[in-house]
């Protein structure tokens, strides 16, 4: 988790002088509780936005927006703590809005936004806005939290972000898989414009099972420049196992920008349709 590299983060607006500060996620009001504390944020909304860094890179960001309740507690509102928690790693990043002037009621509801938390593709977050000072122990909570899901790199807008492009999101291998005679599969895919090797991972399964019955790995050497964007054709030999008929072909590239961690593409071949008429049952049963 990090903040987008903007020169100065701004939270001031007409009628309010405000500054954005880094925060340890442990506001002073936790340690020194105040008697009078503001009410919680209203209508917290988190949206996926996209922003450029000063270097021109495009990143997904969490756009956080909320409003204030129209009660007298805004007279005691000194700021807000914004927290983004990555759910699995428990990594947390916070910033603090510090109000340098007192809020007053005006004809419009006060609205705040912040769009500088960089988020990762395919990750899950909890976003919390805490009004400051935080409540006394056992006081009514004055925060609001929302869960937030960032799409993966297959999402149209995500695909062109810097982290997705670095993991190979622009490569579309257009995989085709064809079943041949003699227990073989022909795999065809489009090479990318980089002289890097690929790996084909074949996993086969029985018709309705999820436990594999055959696995095979095939290495494809780095193509020459004249082969970039051309189709690569590979024939894989299958294990002759009855019922081991559903095949998943996964292609793993090793681009220089993502090495072992590039996006993989896969295609699946289903088992052939079962005939409607059942097989005749033999009039004797083997004993083995």
């Amino acid at each position: 988790l990090r903040l987008l590299d903007h020169r100065a983060l701004v939270c001031s607006q007409p009628g309010l002088n405000c500054t954005v500060k880094n925060s340890t996620c442990l506001d002073d009001s936790w340690i020194h509780p105040r008697n009078l504390t503001p009410s919680s944020p209203k209508d917290l909304q988190i949206q996926l936005h996209f922003a450029h860094t000063q270097q021109g890179d495009l990143f997904p960001v969490a756009h956080i927006e909320w409003t204030l309740q129209t009660d007298a507690s805004i007279l005691y509102l000194e700021g807000a703590e914004l927290s983004v928690l990555q759910l699995n790693t428990n990594e947390r990043l916070c910033v603090r809005f510090e109000f340098l002037s007192k809020l007053r009621h005006h004809h419009r509801r006060w609205r705040f936004t912040f769009s500088h938390f960089v988020v990762d593709p395919d990750q899950e977050y909890e976003v919390t806005v805490h009004h400051l000072p935080k409540p006394i122990p056992d006081g009514d909570p004055n925060h609001q939290s929302k869960n937030f899901l960032v799409p993966d790199c297959e999402h149209a807008r995500m695909k062109v972000t810097t982290p997705c492009m670095s993991s190979g999101s622009l490569w579309d291998p257009n995989i085709t898989v064809e079943t041949l005679e003699a227990h073989q599969l022909r795999v065809s895919f489009t090479l990318w414009n980089e002289s890097t090797h690929y790996q084909i991972l074949l996993t086969s399964f029985p018709h309705m099972e999820n436990h594999s019955c055959f696995e095979h790995m095939h290495h494809i050497p780095a193509p020459r420049p004249e082969e970039f964007h051309q189709r690569s054709n590979v024939t894989l030999t299958l294990r002759n196992l009855k019922g081991c008929c559903r095949h998943q072909v996964q292609i793993q590239p090793f681009f220089s920008s993502c090495l072992n961690d590039c996006l993989r593409h896969s295609a699946t071949v289903s088992c052939p349709e079962m005939p409607d008429t059942p097989e005749p049952i033999p009039d004797y049963m083997p004993l083995w």
């Epitope: 759910l87 699995n88 899950e124 929302k146 869960n147 899901l149």
Partner: antibody, heavy 116, light 107 residues
Framework: QVQLVQSGAEVKKPGASVKVSCKAS????????ISWVRQAPGQGLEWMGW????????NYAKKFLGRVTMTTDTSTSTAYMELRSLRSDDTAVYYC?????????WGQGTLVTVSS | DIQMTQSPSSLSASVGDRVTITCRAS??????LNWYQQKPGKAPKLLIY???NLQSGVPSRFSGSGSGTDFTLTISSLQPEDFATYYC?????????FGQGIKVEIK
Amino acid sequence: QVQLVQSGAEVKKPGASVKVSCKASGYTWTSYGISWVRQAPGQGLEWMGWISTYSGNTNYAKKFLGRVTMTTDTSTSTAYMELRSLRSDDTAVYYCARRVLRLDYWGQGTLVTVSS
Amino acid sequence: DIQMTQSPSSLSASVGDRVTITCRASQSVHTGLNWYQQKPGKAPKLLIYGASNLQSGVPSRFSGSGSGTDFTLTISSLQPEDFATYYCQQFEHNPLTFGQGIKVEIK
């Protein structure tokens, strides 16, 4: 190929405990949390909570607080869900699933029957 | 807790039909909604996440739309393997909650 394989069916008496395991393969274990969802016979899905495979942090549904414990073993890429003080209405299929908010891969389910 | 209500409770359709299933949240979940398919005796399978994003490997005949409180799952041309129960699930607010499910049956 991402796979979550759960332990086998269990029959328990009321008041007993059950511990269901969920072994993952095909991905980096600490990259995604594990959620637990249950489904009573003929009923819908009920979220029980989740555990961070990275930090061990847990988040339980209020209904199960005090009765459920979720743990993980990083060395074997296995998650566990223990439910105590079982009652007959805990009879259900218990599923583990990868991730926290969108449950993209699921175990095959473990049927827990609570009967005297 | 947020209540998720699906309608209709069940529906009958034929192969090739366009099928629409709706899900309503008791309060806004913005786009924090997933759709799952479950066949008898099997675990649920994720179809759509974040209201409209197609999960990898799911056929493109499935699509999702909506935001706020009203959401729709559409199957553009029903296939034999699509006869199943469909659940919506909101994830914006804790605890995560599921709809009661809608069974799509063969007419």
